[in-house]
Amino acid sequence: FQTFEGDLKWHHHNITYWIQNYSEDLPRAVIDDAFARAFALWSAVTPLTFTRVYSRDADIVIQFGVAEHGDGYPFDGKDGLLAHAFPPGPGIQGDAHFDDDELWSLGKGVVVPTRFGNADGAACHFPFIFEGRSYSACTTDGRSDGLPWCSTTANYDTDDRFGFCPSERLYTQDGNADGKPCQFPFIFQGQSYSACTTDGRSDGYRWCATTANYDRDKLFGFCPTRADSTVMGGNSAGELCVFPFTFLGKEYSTCTSEGRGDGRLWCATTSNFDSDKKWGFCPDQGYSLFLVAAHEFGHALGLDHSSVPEALMYPMYRFTEGPPLHKDDVNGIRHLYGPRPEPEPRPPTTTTPQPTAPPTVCPTGPPTVHPSERPTAGPTGPPSAGPTGPPTAGPSTATTVPLSPVDDACNVNIFDAIAEIGNQLYLFKDGKYWRFSEGRGSRPQGPFLIADKWPALPRKLDSVFEERLSKKLFFFSGRQVWVYTGASVLGPRRLDKLGLGADVAQVTGALRSGRGKMLLFSGRRLWRFDVKAQMVDPRSASEVDRMFPGVPLDTHDVFQYREKAYFCQDRFYWRVSSRSELNQVDQVGYVTYDILQCPED
């Protein structure tokens, strides 16, 4: 092992870390878990503890970025440099950055969580063997219903463990059809569609009708993405493999390296490569975020590279499923921080925790057997920034909400949107809303159905605000906005109509900014918005952290309450007060405990 001159290290043992943003390659829970397990490797052999916090004054700030990402050490595109970390110290020192041009996985291909089947929601195992053949993506082979499935172990033939892959034939997301699967073919604007489409939308999201006729029923959902078969490079980057496809007259129902001298797997993105010549590379094994993070955190704790090839701190990436820490790594970190106080713990497990089981539905039988009944459970939750507007018109009224523990606002982890309307705080989540009035011992009232009060709205909202003078209510969802004045509604209208370009995927919040003016937020950017003209001033575009230093860069909701600005990330808010033109964070807290006064039991 090696350390740098002067044994640079942290001088406290309770190290904090902040996950500033996420890669799209893995579910957030998997990323959180990979980082937690990587830290656990080091805490298992030292007196160090690692606590996740939600502010930039954490010791170790974790960030995904590409190319030039704000320091003097740019990333280099796919492969090559995977990540980098700074040695311990204040500011950027100690931080760990991950190149988001890589495919992040757990080292064994894209992570595709399954539903139903008999594997309790475990992720697909790629490649897997089925009937003696190797599959590197989900397949419909062995089924007559067209549902894509995968084995959750290396060999389905011997282990019999499987689950269904994300598929529009199984469920849809968001929309207004409560997660029902697509109905193919369906009619939209008089035309017949037998696959998901982006027609009628300007944001590129794929959708489908969930009944045979969208024009009549107006019921739709968004098609889940298929990470296992989204191609890279070739001439169809971002499109899906189509299985089976024809290549040189032969049919292929999985990715192949035929026709290539380099062994790289590819697929066609139409059913016939010979005629259409559309293709791309299939996802590779990716890099284990857990292993790369464990290495980078070693640097962030003060370890230099090791010259022992088997050590975690050796400078070359090597996938392993065994315990990552070598004796040399342990000696190095203990040289800096000493051993963990007795008794020695058992070494941390490095196996991936299984995702929680899906809702109980009828089992669907093994792939070779037609399921006795199509699974009926809705999706476990919409994507965090998923679209919610319909293709061309507002969705139909939502149905009544069954009672469940989530009906208590205090049990809601993250609200879709929060807004001060009148003198009350409104909190929106999945087609429901609560009202809250501040006061001793007061509790949120509700839930009420959004559809009962504002029937044109989708279930999932990104942000809401009330313009005080006109009492107009603006509801944003995906690339669309609805404006309610009393019971009458204008919309849905596309964000383009407000002067927001196609690169603005959603409006994540709004703050008052003088008479008849608002600030509209989308991710890291904001614009001045004239409520009367219902237009943004394109020249007013600015970076959020310029005007509001100290707030998270990945807030999902911004709202005003009691004359203060609240920036929400995860379950937390950053409250900003303005004094003499200076915006300063004066409080960080939990939405539930600190705003809604929920009990902390």
């Epitope: 320091d71 003097g72 050490y73 280099d76 995977l82 970390a85 500011g91 950027i92 010259s307």
Partner: antibody
């Protein structure tokens, strides 16, 4: 002992080409970012290009982008700079320099070892 | 790009005196600053990295300080071999940039 030895400089006409080499020894060459830095006669230092350990990451100063190509052969412990479409303003002593930073362990700002330099003169 | 401004352009001091060289960045670069010494006909030599760490083999009379935008290289007591040109270089943001240099000459 760490050593960097440049070669390949000389007199070339505008529009011409040259290939500089830098032979490295005394350290694990394949672990480090390597740089070319130049100094026009009587002037200050200007970075030209950097290459990351695996050779995948290459970056260039705006003044040479599209004309110069940096590369490395880790098996030979050698750094290269291919210079095409040379101009009079490219006249300088070209140094190769070893970064204190590894590819992925950063924050150690500084070039801790430099070659003796090789003079490139672009003139008609 | 971040501009690095060194002052003074020339500093005339006698052996044994204390030399203070300044380097200012056009925006904050944290502590990502290095100092180099260059003598005529020679390659630059790293003196200080990350604003305040002395490089291997550099005498203790050389010290660096500062963070953010203002940095100082101090030579506590000048020796005859210290007369040279001194450059600062930043890596707080991409691309790296050098200062224009300070010439330290014998008074």
């Amino acid at each position: 002992e760490v050593q960097l030895l440049e070669s390949g400089g000389g007199l070339v006409q505008p529009g011409g080409s040259l290939r500089l080499s830098c032979a490295a020894s005394g350290f694990t060459f394949s672990w480090y970012n390597m740089w070319w830095v130049r100094q026009a006669p009587g002037k200050g230092l200007e970075w030209v290009s950097v290459i990351y350990p695996s050779g995948g990451g290459t970056f260039y100063a705006d003044s040479v982008k599209g004309r110069f190509t940096i590369s490395r052969d880790n098996s030979k412990n050698t750094l290269y700079l291919q210079m095409n479409s040379l101009r009079a303003e490219d006249t300088a002593v070209y140094y190769c320099a070893k970064d204190r930073a590894y590819g992925d362990y950063v924050g150690w700002n500084g070039f801790d070892y430099w070659g003796q330099g090789t003079l490139v003169t672009v003139s008609s | 790009d971040i501009q690095m401004t060194q002052s003074p352009a020339t500093l005339s001091l006698s052996p044994g005196e204390r030399a203070t060289l300044s380097c200012r960045a056009s925006q904050s670069i944290s502590s990502f600053l290095a100092w180099y010494q260059q003598k005529p006909g020679q390659a630059p030599r790293l003196l200080i990295y990350d604003a305040s760490y002395r490089a291997t083999g550099i005498p203790a009379r050389f010290s660096g300080s500062g963070s953010g935008t203002d940095f100082t290289l101090t030579i506590s007591s000048l020796e005859p071999e210290d007369y040279a040109v001194y450059y600062c270089q930043q890596r707080g943001n991409w691309p790296i940039t050098f200062g224009q240099g300070t010439r330290l000459e014998i008074k």
